[in-house]
């Protein structure tokens, strides 16, 4: 399935233009910004989604302790270069010829440089820690119920096999969802954890990427789970390379 045939829309990506001009009059959808054809039966890559979101305003926004190599997306929005598969190109540059290297989720992993900067390969983000703080509730959520509901959500809404949800931690009011996916584990057709995390992040912020669906209504045993803060940490298979100047 590439798109919903009946009304020719893309259920998994509202930032598309769809028309019945595919083979045999089938509905085909192209991402805004890049014009690339997208598979509407699965999540669109984060790179193509960011590209489509060019005009959107910048919106900056233990349990597991993120490692010293964990990255947080402090740079916010930019207009990325995507490869023919829709993945981020390892090197990204802006209009003023400032360049930097990114990981597979498009987060900068080196200092900024000039056009001579080399990024030899796209480094895979294999571990994502989604740190949520929920609004006060009458009592704490049952950890097991919370775990089950979040796994169900990632499977049914974001198409992510539960084997990539490594753990759900909970110490009221903080919830941490650990997504892990090594290169060797990811089979053809598997949703990338980076894409699932991005869709989840946008859902949590009330900026759903899904076509014509209501926003995310997260409930645990009927009790609404309302998130008031989200932080996402990204861990790469190869640690990032920043100068000491940045670290101080």
């Amino acid at each position: 399935h590439t798109a919903a045939q009946d009304n020719c829309t893309c259920p998994t990506n509202k930032m598309t233009v769809c028309s019945p001009d595919g083979p045999g009059g089938r509905c085909q959808c192209r991402a805004l910004g890049s014009g690339m054809a997208v598979d509407c039966s699965t999540l669109t890559s984060k790179c193509l989604l960011l590209k489509a979101r060019m005009s959107a305003p910048k919106n900056a926004r233990t349990l597991v302790r993120p490692s010293e190599h964990a990255l947080v997306d402090n740079d916010g929005l930019y207009d990325p270069d995507c490869d023919p598969e829709g993945r981020f190109k390892a090197r990204q540059c802006n209009q003023t010829s400032v360049c930097w290297c990114v990981n597979s989720v498009g987060v900068r992993r080196t200092d900024k440089g000039d056009l001579s900067l080399r990024c030899d390969e796209l480094v895979r983000t294999h571990h994502i820690l989604i740190d949520l703080r929920h609004r006060p509730t009458a009592g704490a959520f049952n950890h097991s119920d919370l775990d089950a509901e979040l796994r169900r959500l990632f499977r049914e809404r974001y198409r992510l096999h539960p084997k990539f949800v490594a753990a759900v931690h909970y110490e009221q009011p903080t919830i941490q969802i650990e997504l892990r996916q090594n290169t060797s584990q990811k089979a053809a057709g598997d949703v990338d954890i980076g894409d699932a995390a991005y869709y989840f992040e946008r859902d949590i912020k009330g900026e759903s990427l899904f076509q014509g669906r209501g926003g995310l209504d997260l409930r645990v045993r009927g009790e609404p789970l309302q998130v008031e803060r989200t932080l996402i940490y990204y861990l790469d298979e190869i640690p990032p390379k920043f100068s000491m100047k940045r670290l101080t």
């Epitope: 539960p162 084997k163 753990a167």
Partner: antibody, heavy 119, light 111 residues
Framework: QVQLVQSGAEVKKPGASVKVSCKAS????????INWVRQAPGQRLEWMGV????????SYNQKFKGRVTITRDTSASTAYMELSSLRSEDTAVYYC????????????WGQGTLVTVSS | EIVLTQSPATLSLSPGERATLSCRVS??????????MHWYQQKPGQAPRLLIY???NLESGIPARFSGSGSGTDFTLTISSLEPEDFAVYYC?????????FGGGTKVEIK
């Protein structure tokens, strides 16, 4: 309470097709994917495929080489499994089963539909 | 595909005895400590019923005499003290990888 109710037994001739339905109740239909599993006499249970009730697309066990089609009708809270080019070895009880919450276990099952293929 | 081998094929025991059923998997079904292995009970003319999920988690409504253990490629279902209604066929199943597969079953019969 959660219930999956399947259509009745069928007798088919070799080469024909059969379509089995599975009506869900007691929960929000689009919250859980539906699987189809069959059990031939004296054989182990065999997973045929799964449909996302949310999106409507299905993935299949390659063993069935395009002979199986799983669909759903959200307005009727019903999933369907159609098997074509039937042969005698397709004689089996066909079950629908709902994914459980967290680990792709099958937590609720239909009562089963016996499909007999005989000339 | 992942192959599941159950043993023994038949277990003849008396009510009150302990039953130990084994399921061996051709490759690991462990992902970051989560084992995608489940156990079902099936009685004649009925659909299977989920007993244990994720190797050791007791499904809601299942008596505590049922327990599951194991990780990676070796799993065990234990019934601590057999009740008359426990005589049935038991199947293990993996949901780590598509196509999901089942074991051949262990029949627990009255001795």
């Amino acid at each position: 309470q959660v219930q999956l109710v399947q259509s009745g037994a069928e007798v088919k001739k070799p080469g024909a097709s059969v379509k089995v339905s599975c009506k869900a109740s007691g929960y929000t239909f689009t919250d859980y994917s539906i699987n189809w599993v069959r059990q031939a006499p004296g054989q182990r249970l065999e997973w045929m495929g799964v449909i996302s009730t949310y999106y409507g697309d299905a993935s299949y066990n390659q063993k069935f080489k395009g002979r199986v089609t799983i669909t759903r009708d959200t307005s009727a809270s019903t999933a369907y499994m159609e098997l074509s080019s039937l042969r005698s070895e397709d004689t089996a009880v066909y079950y629908c089963a709902r994914y459980g919450d967290g680990y792709n276990q099958f937590d609720y099952w239909g009562q089963g539909t016996l499909v007999t293929v005989s000339s | 595909e992942i192959v599941l081998t159950q043993s023994p094929a038949t277990l003849s025991l008396s009510p009150g005895e302990r039953a130990t059923l084994s399921c061996r998997v051709s490759e690991s079904v462990d992902s970051y400590g989560n084992n995608f292995m489940h156990w079902y009970q099936q009685k004649p003319g009925q659909a299977p019923r989920l007993l244990i999920y994720r190797a050791s988690n007791l499904e809601s409504g299942i008596p505590a005499r049922f327990s599951g253990s194991g990780s990676g490629t070796d799993f065990t279902l234990t019934i601590s003290s057999l009740e008359p209604e426990d005589f049935a066929v038991y199947y293990c199943q993996q949901s780590y990888e598509d196509p999901y597969t089942f074991g051949g079953g262990t029949k627990v019969e009255i001795k």
